[in-house]
């Protein structure tokens, strides 16, 4: 009679985490008499998974009734999978002994592989506004994922970005691995509604890859242009001025008009217009009467933009002869007046 | 913002079991990020014990392999530490954290925990 | 596992002094190596990542740099509130492994 073989059919299987393993094993006679072992790995360090006669193993069911008589068919389930089980898988049969059972054959053995899906990259960017022109890193990571090969790309609004780090922890042997990596984005006064899209290639996700994002409009501080104008009488002792606030981001925007150095009024920008590329215009006028004022008058529209330090932008106020038109309305709201006698 | 806070007895008797969890506010422990377990000896000794993954796969440092479980429970946002067979050895501040890459941006404020009988 | 050795164990420094701590791995680890700052009864605070590279709302007087085996902290102009233990971690191979810290003290 030919000599029992053990047969593990499968070189390798593949498992994705929390899944089920199926590792396959057939004996080729029912003699000798003797249980079957699997164990995780070779030589005196291996590691038992199961063992037909005695032990008590929560996550392995048989496929078959090993108490059958006639049974031939050793194969193993492993519930739960975790990438911690990977590794190579032997089923030995043992002949029976005394006093204790000796090792007759092992099958060739099965590598179990294990897949873990990458969590959702999460994006984030710097901690403080920067403005156009400025250099900013965002920063990408997902986790939990094996095996350890992984590709990530960065995108600004669909384009592919090329100054990038990209660190995968660790290096070295692990059940799961991180993957970490800052970009560099240069800002331009057009980012208000741009995006930066790290985007994660793994072979869990069947050529679907995950992406975050990072809205640019969260990261952006586009400084205002101002603009100071004289518009035309709108009786003989009075003058309009206007000061057009125009390109800013975010709205959050403060106004003080100034009366030859003194503060004349203060208001917030609420009702802005907003420009197609995200950015605000927004514009305040003071009415002055000039009827009774024998010197010129330094108006000045100073402007408090997100926090940052005051921008200013001056008119004179030529109050000697008959005021004339020395420019033209061109924003679109006259969102805040004030009338002023100077005497 | 993320914060993390450890909570469990403070004296456990020499051969029996220390169980603490870490309550997670801030952040989905199921969205991402590892959630680690490291303890602190007197005489500046940090030592990292084993971490779980956002969607459960756990890690442990080999020195404690046998004696070491991380679970967690993301509809409580907590994760657990259980660790089987003290002795006075294991008395240590243990730290839950959240781990970026390789290392742990975001600290719990630590739980003191004595072995003695 | 990777052994992590730092030095000096104490170092006693004056407001305003530019200060050197030393961080040595027992095998090549790239640049994976982490910097953290705990103060008495605080827990750690990550200072650096990946040898150089900084930690938003981190004090730019902290600096470090390196890679292999042999890695720096550097802290520009010490002020009061640096005092404490300053580790660093290997983040290379795992077990993660942290040095035994040096000791931060204001004369």
């Known amino acids: 009679e030919e000599e029992l073989q053990v047969i593990q059919p499968d070189k390798s299987v593949l498992v994705a985490a929390g899944e089920t393993a199926t590792l396959r094993c057939t004996a080729t006679s029912l003699i000798p008499v003797g249980p079957i072992q699997w164990f995780r790995g070779a030589g005196p360090g291996r590691e038992l998974i199961y063992n037909q006669k005695e032990g008590h193993f929560p996550r392995v069911t048989t496929v078959s009734d090993l108490t059958k008589r006639n049974n031939m068919d050793f194969s193993i389930r492993i519930g739960n999978i975790t990438p911690a089980d990977a590794g190579t898988y032997y089923c030995v049969k043992f002949r029976k002994g005394s006093p204790d059972d000796v090792e007759f054959k092992s099958g060739a053995g099965t590598e179990l592989s294990v897949r873990a899906k990458p969590s959702a990259p999460v994006v984030s960017g710097p901690a403080a506004r920067a403005t156009p022109q400025h250099t900013v890193s965002f920063t990408c990571e997902s986790h939990g994922f094996s095996p350890r090969d992984i590709t990530l790309k960065w995108f600004k609004n669909g384009n592919e970005l090329s100054d990038f780090q990209t660190n995968v922890d660790p290096v070295g042997e692990s059940v799961s691995y991180s993957i970490h990596s800052t970009a560099k984005v240069v800002l331009t006064r057009e980012d208000v509604h741009s995006q930066v899209i790290c985007e994660v290639a793994h072979v869990t996700l069947q050529g679907d890859p995950l992406r975050g994002t990072a809205n640019l409009s969260e990261t952006i501080r586009v400084p205002p242009t101002l603009e100071v104008t004289q518009q035309p009488v709108r009786a003989e002792n009075q003058v309009n001025v206007t000061c057009q606030v125009r390109k800013f981001y975010p709205q959050r925007l403060q106004l003080t008009w100034l009366e030859n150095g003194n503060v004349s009024r203060t208001e917030t920008a609420s009702t802005v217009t907003e420009n197609k590329d995200g950015t605000y215009n927004w514009m305040s006028w003071l009415l002055v009467n000039v009827s009774a004022h024998r010197d010129d008058v330094k108006l000045t529209c100073q402007v408090e933009h997100d926090g940052q330090p005051a921008v200013s932008k001056s008119h004179d106020l030529k109050v000697s002869a008959h005021p004339k038109e020395q420019g033209s309305n061109t924003a679109a709201e006259n969102t805040g007046s004030n009338e002023r006698n100077i005497y | 913002d993320v914060q993390l806070q450890e909570s469990g007895p403070g004296l456990v008797k020499p051969s029996q079991s220390l169980s603490l969890t870490c309550t997670v506010t801030g952040f989905s422990i199921s969205r991402g990020y590892d959630w680690h377990w490291i303890r602190h000896f007197p005489g500046n000794i940090l030592e990292w014990m084993g971490y779980?993954?956002?969607?459960?796969?756990?890690n442990y440092n080999p020195s404690l392999k046998s004696r070491i479980s991380i679970t967690h429970d993301t509809s409580k946002n907590h994760f657990f530490l259980r660790l089987n067979s003290v002795t006075a050895e294991d008395t240590a501040t243990y730290y839950c954290a959240r781990g970026g890459g390789a290392w742990f941006t975001y600290w719990g404020q630590g739980t003191l925990v004595t072995v003695s009988a | 596992d990777i052994v992590m050795t730092q030095s000096p164990a104490t170092l006693s420094v004056t407001p305003g002094d530019r200060v050197s701590l030393s961080c040595r791995a027992s095998q090549s680890i790239s640049d994976s190596l982490h910097w953290y700052h705990q103060k008495s009864h605080e827990s750690p605070r990550l200072l650096i990542k990946?040898?150089?590279q900084s930690i938003s709302g981190i004090p730019s007087r902290f600096s470090a740099g390196g890679s292999g085996s042999d890695f720096t902290l550097t802290i520009n102009s010490v002020e009061p509130e640096d005092v404490g233990v300053y580790y660093c971690?290997?983040?290379?191979?795992?077990?993660?492994?942290f040095g035994g810290g040096t000791k931060l003290e204001i004369k």
């Open positions: 779980i993954t956002y969607s459960g796969i756990s």
């Open positions: 971690q290997n983040g290379h191979s795992l077990p993660w492994t």
């Open positions: 990946y040898a150089s």
